[in-house]
């Protein structure tokens, strides 16, 4: 019955079983509802808007990493509908802390104004 179906399942009245909601492809996100036993008849997948990406499945589109604005890094690969942006080396005037574990966002560049003496990215 409906209540037994999981987060991404709908109740198929023909088979009397819970069935997996159709997953979206890379670069798309679900539109309208499917899950916990019900499925909208017009349920489908829409493309990710500009500056967002999705790997597909039931994932909503997420914003690309802001390499320059947030990480103060160069853009190695710009993101598209299917892939996140990849950040490269720090922007001029910024450096990366050595031996610092990556945080949840990856590596963050810091201003040379805060750099220890002789930091290679900040010399000259």
């Amino acid at each position: 019955e409906y209540s037994n179906c999981g987060e991404n399942e709908y109740y198929n009245q023909t088979t009397g079983l819970c069935q997996e909601c159709p997953p979206c492809g890379p670069g798309e996100e679900p539109y309208l509802s499917c899950g916990y036993g019900t499925k909208d008849e017009d349920y489908g997948c829409v493309p990710c808007p500009a500056e967002k990406f999705s790997k597909g499945g039931y994932q909503i589109c997420r914003r690309h990493k802001d390499c320059e604005g947030f990480f103060r890094a160069t853009v190695l690969t710009p993101g598209d509908m299917e892939n996140d942006a990849e950040c490269g080396p720090c922007l001029p005037g910024y450096y990366m802390l050595e031996n610092r574990p990556r945080n949840i966002y990856g590596m963050v560049c810091y201003s040379c104004l805060l750099a220890p003496p002789n930091t290679k990215e900040c010399v000259g």
């Epitope: 798309e28 008849e41 017009d42 489908g44 829409v46 493309p47 990710c48 808007p49 500009a50």
Partner: antibody
């Protein structure tokens, strides 16, 4: 085999009625939402109406609301458009078009049937 | 309703040319933009869906791009069989709307 074939077009007097049909073949009709789209002579395409696979969702363009009725018979793999109170501006080629599963565009179109509203 | 504008109603190009047809939406349609080809005999065919994805069986010379409100269809190596009218269509919200069409002819 043509997947979508419209019929029922012809000459109708203003204020008259007409019922168009669209016969589907070569695919599981009951899995697909279906649309009617029209094109007036020397004009662009205009979306007219949509019906979901199981008929639970039906939508119309404002220009036809209250005068046209979209319906379907999944057992006979046929889509219909009942047109009433016809006006000269309804003169057009009427196409039925299939909505791709899970997507929001028309992936297969019929060849169209012409409706002419004139006295 | 979302208005779709194809600023060029007709254009003429030579065989082998690269042709770009543009389409503008009255508001952001989040890449939910599709392109159709209507041949002179009236037959309509889907070419590109969701801005840049090619429908199966469509020649690789057809490509799409854009984002937000501005989109384009490019034919990279014009062939005789490409003589047709091209329509953009937004599938973001009902009522679905189409551009006025761009009629492509060979010089």
């Amino acid at each position: 085999e043509v997947p979508l074939e419209e019929s029922g077009g012809g000459l109708v007097k203003p204020g008259g009625s007409r019922k168009l049909s669209c016969a589907a073949s070569g695919f599981t009709f009951s899995d697909y939402g279906m649309h009617w789209v029209r094109q007036a002579p020397e004009k662009g395409l205009e979306w007219v109406a949509y019906i979901s696979s199981g008929s639970s969702a039906i939508y119309y363009a404002d220009t036809v609301k209250g005068r046209f009725t979209i319906s379907r018979d999944n057992a006979k793999s046929t889509l219909f458009l009942q047109m009433t109170s016809l006006r000269s501006e309804d003169t057009a080629m009427y196409y039925c078009a299939r909505r791709e599963i899970l997507r929001y565009y028309f992936d297969v179109w019929g060849a169209g049937t012409t409706v002419t509203v004139s006295s | 309703d979302i208005q779709m504008t194809q600023s060029t109603s007709s254009l003429s190009a030579s065989l082998g040319d690269r042709v770009t047809i543009s389409c503008r939406a009255s508001q952001d349609i989040s890449n939910n933009l599709n392109w159709y080809q209507q041949r002179p005999d009236g037959t309509v065919k889907l070419l590109i869906y969701y801005t840049s994805r090619s429908q199966s069986g469509v020649p690789s010379r057809f490509s799409g791009s854009g984002s937000g409100t501005d989109y384009s269809l490019t034919i990279s190596n014009l062939e005789q069989e490409d003589v047709a009218t091209y329509f953009c269509h937004q599938g973001k919200t009902l009522p679905y709307t189409f551009g006025g069409g761009t009629k492509l002819e060979i010089k």
